[in-house]
């Protein structure tokens, strides 16, 4: 039975040209995290694997940095980066947990962080 919950940074906004940290945290489970995939819509951004470390997809290498922790840092943001991001936790023995973050990249300097929320 899957008992865990994923807490994410929720709906966030950032300025064009700036950077943002995407963070997820898995709690309420003793399951072992085998791998975390970060995806934007259906595109793979990055992988953090327990045995093999970090992998950043080639098309994002220049603008994506691993960490902090299992999170992901997006740099040199453009308006095209606006959209949904998913952290996919592959765990043993529970299975897969998915967290969603919506990022809005703004032209102006009125960007501010949204509240944290939980996805069961």
């Amino acid at each position: 039975m899957m008992t865990g919950t994923i807490e994410t940074t929720g709906n966030i906004s950032a300025e064009k040209g700036g950077s943002i940290i995407l963070q997820c945290h898995l709690s309420s489970t003793t399951a072992q995290v085998t791998q975390v995939n970060w995806e934007q819509q259906d595109q793979l951004l990055a992988i953090c694997n327990a045995d093999l470390g970090w992998h950043i997809s080639p098309s994002f290498k220049d603008r994506v940095a691993p960490g902090p922790g299992l999170g992901l840092t997006l740099q040199s943001l453009t308006v095209n980066d606006t959209g949904e991001y998913f952290c996919i936790y592959h765990t043993y023995p529970d299975g897969t947990y998915t967290g969603r973050i919506f990022l809005e990249v703004l032209e102006s300097s009125v960007a501010e962080h949204g509240a944290r929320f939980q996805i069961p």
Partner: antibody, heavy 120, light 110 residues
Framework: EVQLLESGGGLVQPGGSLRLSCAAS????????MSWVRQAPGKGLEWVSL????????YYADSVKGRFTISRDNSKNTLYLQMNSLRAEDTAIYYC?????????????WGQGTTVTVSS | QSVLTQPPSASGTPGQRVTISCSGS????????VSWYQQLPGTAPKLLIY???QRPSGVPDRFSGSKSGTSASLAISGLQSEDEADYYC???????????FGGGTKLTVL
């Protein structure tokens, strides 16, 4: 269609060297962990070596450690196995295999294999 | 000798259900995923089961995988003559940092 095509097998004398290649197509090669697996005549499957996405982490079976080197060229979508100090017991069909996006799930696609014969 | 232990042979008649076992340890099967491969004579291995009990698309639902403790099983129901092949279990071993294979089970359809 995902395809793996091995080449480079042949007849070599004990103590000799051989370099196997595996050309990959139909998937984003950079995003997947790859392995070599071999099968001696009339025997079972034996894992040989594994390489992560960019080649900075490699693992080997004890039977080939120090003699074989796995590498990859992501710009050419090609996996390699450099085999040195070959022994009669290295005679086998060598398969390259692509792993699932979570490499611990196993190997989902295999090539047809290339035959290596070590004999004087 | 293989790290994972499988019976060398198994058999059944058409339509029967056959189970192949795979025994390992805490560092592989008990705490990791298991996959199963079918190898028809003269061909490359083909994936049947991954993540212990998941079937890739294209694999008939006659094939199923399960796991309990340090053992895993592959079940084939409604046995057919084309199922005659060698079957291998595989798991990543966290201690050895290597893939470990079972010795293989030769399935004969009588």
């Amino acid at each position: 269609e995902v395809q793996l095509l091995e080449s480079g097998g042949g007849l070599v004398q004990p103590g000799g060297s051989l370099r196997l290649s595996c050309a990959a197509s139909g998937f984003t090669f950079d995003d997947y962990v790859m392995s070599w697996v071999r099968q001696a005549p009339g025997k079972g499957l034996e894992w040989v070596s594994l390489i992560n996405w960019n080649g900075d982490k490699t693992y080997y079976a004890d039977s080939v450690k120090g003699r074989f080197t796995i590498s990859r060229d992501n710009s050419k979508n090609t996996l390699y196995l450099q085999m040195n100090s070959l022994r009669a017991e290295d005679t086998a069909i060598y398969y390259c295999a692509k792993h699932w996006i979570v490499f611990q799930y196993g190997m989902d696609v295999w090539g047809q294999g290339t035959t290596v014969t070590v004999s004087s | 000798q293989s790290v994972l232990t499988q019976p060398p042979s198994a058999s059944g008649t058409p339509g029967q259900r056959v189970t192949i076992s795979c025994s390992g340890s805490i560092s592989n099967i008990e705490t990791k995923y298991v996959s199963w491969y079918q190898q028809l004579p003269g061909t490359a291995p083909k994936l049947l089961i991954y993540n212990s009990d998941q079937r890739p698309s294209g694999v008939p639902d006659r094939f199923s995988g399960s796991k309990s403790g340090t053992s895993a099983s592959l079940a084939i129901s409604g046995l057919q003559s084309e199922d005659e092949a060698d079957y291998y279990c595989v798991s990543w071993d966290a201690s050895l940092k290597s893939w470990v294979f079972g010795g293989g089970t030769k399935l004969t359809v009588l």
